[in-house]
Interface confidence: low
Amino acid sequence: TPEVWVQVQMEATELSSFTVHCGFLGPGSISLVTVSWGGPDGAGGTKLAVLHPELGTRQWAPARQARWETQSSISLALEDSGASSPFANTTFCCKFASFPEGSWESCGSLPPSSDPGLSAPPTPVPILRADLAGILGLSGVLLFGCGYLLHLLRRQKHRPTPRLQPSHTNSQALTAQAWAPSQASQAALHDPYATINTSFCPATLDTAHPNGWASLPTHAAHQPQGPAASASTPILARGSFVSVENGLYTQAGERPPHTGPGLTLFPDCRGPRAVEGRFGVR
């Protein structure tokens, strides 16, 4: 079953500044994201921001900036003028919707012992499901491996022999690349037919669009601009990682997320995918 992760991050530079990061671990396509605080929107929570692939974003105070980070993750920066932050013990919830019957919601908060500015993978909290723990363990190994690789590269740099240093690569980029397979693995674990939406195929096996082209939405033409729109979810500063129940719904029709410059919408997206696997048998 698709999962949503939520991470609350305290900025190292401003202790009263917070950012909420949310991601969807697939396999669906995102149509709408709602971020709320104090609980789920409509169940005691207050809406902070809504992000739509085509129609853009809107936010309400104390939200400062909501943006897409990748095709399956978003971030929301929060304003906080007070020295003693009201966000410290607040629950933040993210709801990813994929109409007509896909909507998943999870919540998270800043851990009590927050040490801002640390670059480390999200820490699994106790409620993390056992089947995901193994995957996260694997991602830990991958992270360690990448760290070790980086160490070797740095050692190589200090030798008189010709250097083999990759251009534009830093430890954070390596970490991000190491983290991405973990997400893909989690999605595949829950749905044997899962494909993380890098191909942006409109896998609408249960729907039909007026123009007959596999329900390609009108809002499939926009991609978040800037460096944040990378294909892998970046590693975020230490915070909570919450993988709660699969929110409200499972999808019966999916649509591609925003696509844009440098990203191609593949014309033949009706490849060998099992209908059962996509829509219900999990």
């Epitope: 789920p40 929107d41 169940a43 919601e105 129940e245 929110g247």
Partner: antibody, heavy 115, light 107 residues
């Protein structure tokens, strides 16, 4: 084939209680969110409550908050609506529905609140 | 709560006619609007979701359009089986709210 079958409707006095059930089949019940929607005789549709796939999240409109409780038993593939402090204006056909929006509906069960 | 105002409340049309039903939301719901068809004594059926996407098995003569606060359901060529009541619904946020309905009758 997706099937939703409601039961438990009937005649009840104002202030009374009633528990509706919705038996589901033809899909993986535990993977889907479910709702109750009602329709008073000759009137339009009104959403009554919603529950997430595992039962963690529940939602209600103000008109029924505190009086109605939605729940589910994923082992039995059954959705419930416990209604208490019933009023005459709660008289309606109650449908259970799957999804967001409501892709599949049951046939409905009539609840009549009258003295 | 978001109010959905549907118009007209009823209309008379003939087989083959083009029929348009409108729905206005009290606030911006982006594209999160669905349309249902209901016949007497039967449960509603989902026709359109997210403004313009036809649900499983829905004929191509049904189409939806709009964005923000104004939405339209169009039946391009009315068929005998299309005489029913149609409802719009916003699925943008809870509480879910429906329009008052439009009854399409035979002229």
């Amino acid at each position: 084939e997706v099937q939703l079958v409601e039961s438990g409707g009937g005649l009840v006095k104002p202030g009374g209680s009633l528990r509706l059930s919705c038996a589901a089949s033809g899909f993986t019940f535990s993977s889907y969110g479910l709702s109750w929607v009602r329709q008073a005789p000759g009137k339009g549709l009104e959403w009554v409550s919603e529950i997430s796939s595992g039962g963690t999240y529940t939602y209600y409109p103000d008109t029924v908050t505190g009086r109605f409780t939605i729940s589910r038993d994923n082992a039995k593939n059954t959705l419930y609506l416990q209604m208490s402090s019933l009023r005459a204006e709660d008289t309606a056909v109650y449908y259970c529905a799957r999804g967001d929006p409501f892709g599949y509906w049951g046939q409905g069960t009539l609840v009549t609140v009258s003295s | 709560d978001i109010q959905m105002t549907q118009s007209p409340s009823s209309l008379s049309a003939s087989v083959g006619d083009r029929v348009t039903i409108t729905c206005k939301a009290s606030q911006d719901v982006m594209t999160a609007v669905a349309w249902y068809q209901q016949k007497p004594g039967k449960a509603p059926k989902l026709l359109i979701y997210s403004t313009s996407y036809r649900f499983t098995g829905v004929p191509s003569r049904f189409s939806g359009s709009g964005s923000g606060t104004d939405f339209t359901l169009t039946i391009s060529s009315l068929q005998p089986e299309d005489f029913a009541t149609y409802y719009c619904q916003q699925h943008y946020s809870t509480p879910r709210t429906f329009g008052g309905g439009t009854k399409v009758e035979i002229k």
